[in-house]
């Protein structure tokens, strides 16, 4: 069984451009989480969904960030406009 699948693996963009990250959770998992990790700030929970419904998006108070989960097998995290300080590793995770 495949694990959580994210794309793209790497993204380089100019400041001000829109960035869209995609995630496919493990089949049968009903919770999905987006995290951000940097050296300076550590691991931050951005948002999590349960049964496709956003439960807590308090980790992304800037309205440049938006996340959607249109169905049980797909989620996106969008940054518009992007800023240099958004440079980080973004993780998607899922759980039962």
């Amino acid at each position: 069984d495949a694990g959580v699948i994210q794309s793209p693996r790497h993204e380089v963009t100019e400041m001000g451009q829109e960035v869209t990250l995609r995630c496919k959770p493990i089949s049968g998992h009903n919770s999905l989480f987006w995290y951000r990790q940097t050296m300076m700030r550590g691991l931050e929970l951005l948002i999590y969904f349960n049964n496709n419904v956003p439960i807590d998006d308090s980790g992304m108070p800037e309205d440049r960030f938006s996340a959607k989960m249109p169905n049980a097998s797909f989620s996106t995290l969008k940054i518009q406009p992007s800023e240099p300080r958004d440079s980080a590793v973004y993780f998607c995770a899922s759980s039962l």
Partner: antibody
Framework: EVQLVESGGGLVQPGGSLRLSCAAS????????MHWVRQAPGKGLEWVSY????????LYADTLKGRFTISRDNSKNTLYLQMNSLRAEDTAVYYC??????????WGQGTTVTVSS | DNQLTQSPSFLSASVGDRVTITCRAS?????AYWYQQKPGKAPKLLIY???NLAPGVPSRFSGSGSGNEYTLTISSLQPEDFATYYC?????????FGQGTKLEIK
């Protein structure tokens, strides 16, 4: 009914410290981001700090970094603002506010901080 | 940091008037948010995501705009609308407010 009640304000000397509290009720505090905002006498609103539900995301106004520390205790439904090295210009009414509708949808009544010798 | 400039800073108007307050951002923002504050009271959210009315806010209030310029309009002023109004942005931290617009009775 959403309620936010600030406390801990008072008169403090320059260089002193104060810890403000904000007791929350009527909503799921442990899933909600919270802000501190202040208003100096006769002046406009100034955003101070933000903390996410689990405290992993914390933001400050640039001018206050290093002196002010935001924190929360979800088991007590309480938000805090620790203020150190206080200056006369920190004199203000301090409000806590709930993050909602992408903004600040509920506010407390405020607590007054006066920094004076 | 972004700067929000409201105009006018002071506005005298009469009951029944239509008034518009403008909020200009030094850098483009995704949305504007508007608050009303009366003397000695906490601010109250009026408009979120540029044009959405907060619960309980009368329909005479409306918001519009995009990019660097946003407006709050009151279609027919009522006595209880005389207050100070603030815009705010959440596109990028720090979450600055405009300096405020004081709406007074003419």
């Amino acid at each position: 009914e959403v309620q936010l009640v600030e406390s801990g304000g008072g008169l403090v000397q320059p260089g002193g410290s104060l810890r403000l509290s904000c007791a929350a009720s009527g909503f799921t505090f442990s899933r909600t981001g919270m802000h501190w905002v202040r208003q100096a006498p006769g002046k406009g609103l100034e955003w101070v700090s933000y903390i996410s539900s689990g405290s992993s995301t914390i933001l400050y106004a640039d001018t206050l970094k290093g002196r002010f520390t935001i924190s929360r205790d979800n088991s007590k439904n309480t938000l805090y603002l620790q203020m150190n090295s206080l200056r006369a210009e920190d004199t203000a009414v301090y409000y806590c506010a709930r993050r909602g509708e992408g903004a600040m949808d509920y506010w407390g009544q405020g607590t007054t901080v006066t920094v004076s010798s | 940091d972004n700067q929000l400039t409201q105009s006018p800073s002071f506005l005298s108007a009469s009951v029944g008037d239509r008034v518009t307050i403008t909020c200009r951002a030094s850098k483009s923002v995704n949305y504007a948010y508007w608050y009303q504050q009366k003397p000695g009271k906490a601010p109250k959210l009026l408009i979120y995501y540029t044009s959405n009315l907060a619960p309980g806010v009368p329909s005479r209030f409306s918001g519009s705009g995009s990019g660097n310029e946003y407006t709050l309009t009151i279609s027919s002023l009522q006595p209880e609308d005389f207050a100070t109004y603030y815009c705010q942005q959440f596109t990028s931290s720090p979450f600055v407010f405009g300096q405020g617009t004081k709406l007074e009775i003419k």
